[in-house]
């Protein structure tokens, strides 16, 4: 059985489109499961992995490896 584009699995009922944009950064494995690109995490692979050590409470990142501090906090790790 050959599945339509972006459909995977037995019965071709698993849907996955590789993407690399605001809404997700992932490839699809042979079963149609999302595999996040390096630096991204979460079920949709749209949450950047911040600089190692970045404060989860006072820092965040839009891009992998960044660590942007909340107002009132500073330092390499926003701690």
């Amino acid at each position: 059985v050959t599945c339509d584009d972006y459909y995977y699995g037995f019965g071709c009922n698993k849907f996955c489109r590789p993407r690399d944009d605001f809404f997700g950064h992932y490839a699809c494995d042979q079963n149609g499961n999302k595999t996040c690109m390096e630096g991204w995490m979460g079920p949709e692979c749209n949450r950047a992995i911040c600089r190692q050590g970045c404060s989860p409470k006072h820092g965040s990142c839009k891009l992998p490896g960044d660590c942007r501090c909340q107002y009132g906090w500073q330092g390499l790790y926003c701690d």
């Epitope: 605001f22 079920p43 949450r47 839009k62």
Partner: antibody, heavy 119, light 107 residues
């Protein structure tokens, strides 16, 4: 279960701004972007933009760029939509909405917030 | 931007009828299409996603089909609770635009 609870109705003057909130519960707030959709009275649905609460990244419909600002507060799992330079055509119900778990489109919706712009 | 053209804009039908609503995209959206049902004063409810997959708790009388630029929502046997407005929406690339809606009324 996933719940999105929005702030109450607003009456605004032309030229002013409005800020609508959307409190999320029942899932990890930072795992999914929050989208905003509006619907003018008797009209169709219009996608305004989205925010990724984890890092604050945003995507906007160009139609609203410059007038709409999306923000999120991770500590309270609340997303906000601020629309400025209001005009009568902005009178609408504003919805926050979230994708489902397997790349669904908008599976979860807030109850809507009516914003009326009138002098 | 991809535009979505939905037809008809309104439709009168009777309980038990088979009803078809169509949606045409201005570009290939590769099955990245959803259908919603909306009742007055309520938020839209997801019916179908990825063109043909039924969302949770949606009755099997609803079905979706199509590919490329042309898509269809079919209700095989209308029930009283199905009278509402239906919208298609693509989610291939931002902005995720909606069709203009189809108001389904009782004949």
């Amino acid at each position: 279960q996933v719940q999105l609870v929005q702030s109450g109705a607003e009456l605004k003057k032309p030229g002013s701004s409005v800020k609508v909130s959307c409190k999320a519960s029942g899932y990890t707030f930072t795992d999914y972007e929050m989208h905003w959709v509006r619907q003018a009275p008797g009209q169709g649905l219009e996608w305004m933009g989205a925010i990724q609460p984890g890092g604050g990244g945003t995507a906007y419909n160009q139609k609203f760029k410059g007038r709409v600002t999306l923000t999120a507060d991770k500590s309270t799992s609340t997303a906000y939509m601020e629309l400025s330079s209001l005009r009568s055509e902005d009178t609408a119900v504003y919805y926050c909405t979230r994708r489902g778990y397997d790349d669904y489109p908008f599976a979860y919706w807030g109850q809507g917030t009516l914003v009326t712009v009138s002098s | 931007d991809i535009q979505m053209t939905q037809s008809p804009s309104s439709l009168s039908a009777s309980v038990g009828d088979r009803v078809t609503i169509t949606c045409r995209a201005s570009g290939n959206i590769h099955n990245y299409l959803a259908w919603y049902q909306q009742k007055p004063g309520k938020a839209p409810k997801l019916l179908i996603y990825n063109a043909k997959t039924l969302a949770d708790d949606v009755p099997s009388r609803f079905s979706g089909s199509g590919s490329g630029t042309d898509y269809t929502l079919t209700i095989s046997s209308l029930q009283p609770e199905d009278f509402a407005t239906y919208y298609c929406q693509h989610f291939w690339s931002a902005p995720w635009t909606f069709g203009g809606g189809t108001k389904l009324e009782i004949k």
